[in-house]
Interface confidence: low
């Protein structure tokens, strides 16, 4: 796996593009065995995890070339409730299909500048970015 | 949220430690409503998602001060099968509790060096790091 160039001063590194935004093709950081085509509210008996789940989901691509990672994937639940383990298709209203969220560390590129204001490549700014990872079958909350 | 310093040449930035590894305490990037204490194979009717799931899990901290993010959390399934939606405690052998994995982009700090071999701060190397995000209740694979 070709790693992203290090963030080091570019001055005096004629052979390396150390501060540059990495534009080398990088394998997209897809969830394992990504399945964009599971679009029905049913639990399959084969295929990737998101289609075999009783809280099945699909992935939506979120691409931003000025962010690392450039590609993020958001889960989208295909059913409001969970699918019956028995049939794999009927919904069981005793369970809810809920999104699991995560604040992921991402880096945005911004122009960065030298002492004299000249453009010195791109800087990275660390940010938290909310992504939905998966749909999870949960027991509904019982309010006290 | 105090962002991690930008990756820019340190030369000519006397007031900023732009290339330095940020050692300012950063709020750990915990999964929302993190619950380390859900250690039983049951689906709760309240609390965070990982304890209400019928494939409940706990989180294990993976801390590396030479990595960004420094704190990662790995899901660990608490049950081999899914918990019954009806009772919230008995296992239903028709469903398996499986880990959902993701190759997350992380950055490791490495010493970086100038043209003459002198130490120029720290560089970042991009890597893919396998993390388990959650446990998902799935229908077992039916082999063809």
């Amino acid at each position: 796996y070709s790693h992203w160039p290090s963030c080091c001063p570019s001055k005096g590194y004629p052979s390396e593009e150390l501060l540059r935004w990495s534009t080398v093709p990088v394998p997209p950081l897809k969830p394992a065995s990504l399945d964009f085509h599971s679009v029905s509210c049913r639990a399959s008996e084969d295929g990737p995890l998101n289609s075999r789940a009783i809280s099945p989901w699909r992935y939506e691509l979120d691409r931003d070339l000025n962010r690392l990672p450039q590609d993020l994937y958001h889960a989208r639940c295909l059913c409001p409730h969970c699918v019956s383990l028995q049939t794999g298709s009927h919904m069981d209203p005793r369970g809810n299909s809920e999104l699991l969220y995560h604040n992921q560390t991402v880096f945005y590129r911004r122009p960065c500048h030298g002492k004299k204001g000249n453009h010195k490549g791109y800087c990275l700014e660390r940010r938290l970015y909310r992504v939905s990872l998966a749909c999870v079958c949960v027991r509904p909350r019982v309010m006290g | 949220y105090s962002h991690w310093p930008s990756c820019c040449p340190s030369k000519g930035y006397p007031s900023e430690e732009l290339l330095r590894w940020s050692t300012v305490p950063v709020p750990p990037l915990k999964p929302a409503s993190l619950d380390f204490h859900s250690v039983s194979c049951r689906a709760s009717e309240d609390g965070p998602l990982n304890s209400r799931a019928i494939s409940p899990w706990r989180y294990e901290l993976d801390r590396d001060l030479n990595r960004l993010p420094q704190d990662l959390y790995h899901a660990r399934c608490l049950c081999p099968h899914c918990v019954s939606l009806q009772t919230g405690s008995h296992m239903d052998p028709r469903g398996n509790s499986e880990l959902l994995y993701h190759n997350q982009t992380v950055f490791y700090r490495r010493p970086c060096h100038g043209k003459k071999g002198n130490h120029k701060g720290y560089c970042l190397e991009r890597r893919l790091y396998r993390v388990s995000l959650a446990c998902v209740c799935v229908r077992p694979r039916v082999m063809g």
């Epitope: 593009e17 453009h119 010195k120 | -």
Partner: antibody
């Protein structure tokens, strides 16, 4: 005085691959960013993508699946390949240099452009 | 993508008169840390490649006559030709180089009235 010259076939059949080369003279291709831009007849300019002399590339997402830009530092050249062309790819294709030896400013040196027609 | 729009599409100005072209970006291309706008203006004469006139929204390139000036910040920019000359007949494009993909405005055609 750096000069750029585009070369390649002026006529390409639909579904084939358009291939163009930009030759840099009067200076080195090293340490600069180099872009391809196109201009359909009577229309505006569209940035296709750039390459750094080290080989790093960045493409316009609207064309990304069909574009490859490569560099040959030994020949002081960089090239454009655009696959599966249609009539909509008929345009004047320009190569250009970015106005800095280490970053992506505006484009200060342009080739004269070469007209590519996609037709059977 | 950052969308660049220009107005007017075309304008005709008498020799020696002022010509003004505006350019708008769909999001700010001002970098707050150094107060620079990542905007360029190009001139394209018939049958020729574009020529870089102005960088950083207002910095004239070497050899460009001082009748050309750029102004504006954030999302709104202007190219002014203070005293139009016959050789200024061309199409003028603005372009942002803040984020990829780099994008151009649709162009403004300037003619002599």
């Amino acid at each position: 005085q750096v000069q750029l010259q585009e070369s390649g076939p002026g006529l390409v059949k639909p579904s084939e691959t358009l291939s163009l080369t930009c030759t840099v003279s009067g200076g080195s291709i090293s340490s600069y960013y180099w872009s391809w831009i196109r201009q359909p007849p009577g229309k505006g300019l569209e940035w296709i993508g750039f390459i750094y002399y080290s080989g790093s590339t960045n493409y316009n997402p609207s064309l990304k699946s069909r574009v490859t830009i490569s560099v040959d530092t030994s020949k002081n050249q960089f090239s454009l390949k655009l696959s599966s062309v249609t009539a909509a790819d008929t345009a004047v294709y320009y190569c250009a240099r970015h106005d800095s030896d280490y970053e992506l400013y505006g484009m200060d040196v342009w080739g004269q452009g070469t007209t590519v027609t996609v037709s059977s | 993508d950052i969308v660049m729009t220009q107005s007017p599409d075309s304008l005709a100005v008498s020799l020696g008169e002022r010509a003004t072209i505006t350019c708008k970006s769909s999001q700010s291309i001002l970098y707050n840390s150094d107060n620079k706008n990542y905007l360029a203006w190009y001139q394209q004469k018939s049958g020729q490649p574009p020529k870089l006139l102005i960088s950083w929204a207002s910095t004239r390139e070497s050899g460009v006559p001082d009748r050309f000036s750029g102004s504006g910040s954030g999302t709104d920019f202007t190219l002014t030709i203070s005293s139009l000359q016959a050789e200024d007949v061309a199409v003028y494009y603005c372009q942002q180089y803040f984020f990829t993909p780099f994008t151009f405005g649709p162009g403004t055609k300037v003619d002599i009235k």
